[in-house]
């Protein structure tokens, strides 16, 4: 280790490179400066992402993976640091960058939105479930009429190209559907989506975007909702949605609409049953929706409401939605 009175001059790392290793993914690599003295001290490196989004962190190893959009270019710097309890010594920065890809910004797509959904797998020999992906976008305002767009997603180490597109009136792809993907329902990794394009008339700038799964996962509605009236008690029950998340991971909202006076009651629950006191003169429609609870992942989207069930008035026998 360094003695208190020992002077050390820190030199910047060498051979700093940025390599694109996948869709919206780069690998930063560098080497320790060969002229660095006191090689036995605990040297670290500070990595600074300059663009497209500022970030900085420290590492002891000489490489770093970074998940980032690349359509705006990418710029990073790294320097050697030596820190103890009292001070921080640092070298000058070594920098590298990736330029924005060719094509004017107006040629790339805009308003890319994606949603995931869980469905039963019709192909599987076992009763298993798949994560589907649906994305839509708008054609770039400066894109020539012959522009064609192509969508890819990456999740973890899987990258797939879209095979099922929807088109606009000019035959340009404006939406994509993956019935089955390698996306994990419970995954915590970013979903990376890239839409690039081609035209005979000009370069089309690609567009990539990162999505947090919790923010785009369209939860299925609750299953087997039943409602039954006994006197002035309305009993509602349901089952958890088709989902990778277990039973304790759901919040629910129950909506009870009195069709006679228009009164709307909405209750938020963590259980899969609810009892409401009602008048026995009215007819009611009942709906339930679900969301994954913040106990199990970050807050996300509510499901669609279940199909309405009508009870009350002359319909005192239980009704079931299948």
């Amino acid at each position: 280790d360094l003695l208190p009175d020992e002077k050390i001059s820190l030199l910047p790392p060498v051979n700093f490179t940025i390599k694109v290793t996948g869709l919206a993914q780069v690998l930063l690599q560098w080497k320790p400066n060969p002229d660095q003295e006191q090689r036995n001290v605990n040297l670290e490196y500070q990595v600074k992402i300059n663009a497209p989004k500022e970030d900085d962190y420290e590492t002891r190893i000489t490489e770093s993976k970074c998940v980032t959009i690349l359509h705006k270019g990418f710029s990073a710097s790294v320097r050697t640091i030596l820190q103890n309890d009292h001070s921080l010594l640092a070298s000058s920065w070594a920098s590298a960058e990736l330029h924005a890809p060719p094509g004017s910004p107006g040629t790339s797509i805009v308003n890319l939105t994606c949603t995931t959904n869980t469905t039963e797998d019709n192909y599987s020999r076992l009763r298993s479930y798949q994560v589907s992906l649906h994305c839509t976008w708008l054609v770039g305002t400066d894109a020539p009429e012959d522009t064609q767009y192509f969508l890819y997603y990456r999740y973890g180490s899987w990258t797939e190209e879209c095979q099922e597109y929807s088109k606009d009136t000019l035959g340009r792809n404006i939406a994509c559907w993956f019935p089955r993907t390698f996306i994990l329902s419970k995954g915590r990794d970013w979903l990376a989506v890239l839409v690039n394009g081609s035209s005979k008339h000009s370069a089309i700038r690609p567009f990539d975007q990162l999505f947090a799964l919790h923010a785009i996962d369209q939860i299925n509605p609750p299953l087997n909702v039943t409602a039954e009236i006994e006197g002035t008690r309305l009993s509602i029950q349901w089952e958890k949605p088709v989902s990778a998340f277990p039973i304790h991971c759901f919040d629910y909202e129950v909506k009870i609409h009195n069709t006679r006076n228009g009164y709307l009651q909405i209750e938020k629950l963590m259980t899969n049953a609810f009892i409401s006191i009602i008048d026995d003169l009215s007819k009611y429609d009942v709906q339930v929706r679900a969301a994954v609870s913040s106990m199990c992942r970050e807050a996300g989207l509510w499901s669609e409401w279940s199909q309405p069930i009508y009870v009350g008035n002359d319909e005192h026998k239980p009704l079931r939605e299948w």
């Epitope: 192909y123 973890g156 990778a244």
Partner: antibody
Framework: QVQLQESGGGLVQPGGSLRLSCAAS????????MSWVRQAPGKGLEWVSA????????NYADSVKGRFTISRDNAKNTLYLQMNSLRAEDTAVYYC??????????????WGQGTMVTVSS | QAGLTQPPSVSAAPGQRVTISCSGS?????????VHWYQQVPGTAPKLLIF???NRPSGVPDRFSGSKSGTSASLAITGLQAEDEADYYC????????????FGGGTKLTVL
């Protein structure tokens, strides 16, 4: 009845190459991602590689990346594993298996009987 | 080190109950990812025994069951029979691994 039948194993010298095949029948091959899993003598299972149903997307274990190439011919219902720059540690029984997923987590529902690859001088 | 840890061997007498543990980490089982179990009778290919933590494919007796808690999973076999003597492997998804597939080292079950 799902059937997976591997072939192409044998004895090869270090640095050599070998191509394994897996003939599939009894299911719609083109609907399924497929995989290779290996097992060294007296050892456990090690996932090697996988390929999506259309054959355009592939994945490899770090131990074989850059040396092995997985591919498929859906018209022939056949999965392949091209193995180059073979090493002694690649000696194993190589199994062909379907790469199914449940909520995205992979599992291997059907397996072939395996083909033995021995890398030795 | 990435991977799932299993005991190398377990043994029990016929008719007894035995459990095989599978210990992981936050990058696999601890993230809630499903665990699958395989049975490999000596000299044969592995066979899927349990998928999605606790579901049995058709043809697998209900003597086999799976469970999961925290960063660990376990396989339980009740009413042990001689034909259950085999190697058992757990498998899951690991977000830290290239390719994401992770197996346990395997457990040799001996029926005494």
């Amino acid at each position: 009845q799902v059937q997976l039948q591997e072939s192409g194993g044998g004895l090869v010298q270090p640095g050599g190459s070998l191509r394994l095949s897996c003939a599939a029948s009894g299911f719609t091959f083109s609907n399924y991602a497929m995989s290779w899993v290996r097992q060294a003598p007296g050892k456990g299972l090690e996932w090697v590689s996988a390929i999506n149903s259309g054959g355009k997307s592939t994945n490899y274990a770090d131990s074989v990346k850059g040396r092995f190439t997985i591919s498929r011919d859906n018209a022939k219902n056949t999965l392949y594993l091209q193995m180059n720059s073979l090493r002694a540690e690649d000696t194993a029984v190589y199994y062909c298996a379907d790469y199914a997923t449940n909520y995205g987590v992979p599992y291997f529902g059907s397996w072939g009987q395996g083909t033995m690859v021995t890398v030795s001088s | 080190q990435a991977g799932l840890t299993q005991p190398p061997s377990v043994s029990a007498a016929p008719g007894q109950r035995v459990t095989i543990s599978c210990s992981g980490s936050r990058s696999n089982i601890g993230s809630g990812y499903d665990v699958h179990w395989y049975q490999q009778v000596p000299g044969t290919a592995p066979k899927l025994l349990i998928f999605d933590d606790n579901n049995r494919p058709s043809g697998v007796p209900d003597r086999f069951s799976g469970s999961k808690s925290g960063t660990s999973a376990s396989l339980a076999i009740t009413g042990l029979q001689a034909e259950d003597e085999a190697d058992y492997y757990c498998q899951s998804y690991d977000s830290s691994l290239s390719g994401h597939v992770v197996f346990g080292g395997g457990t040799k079950l001996t029926v005494l």
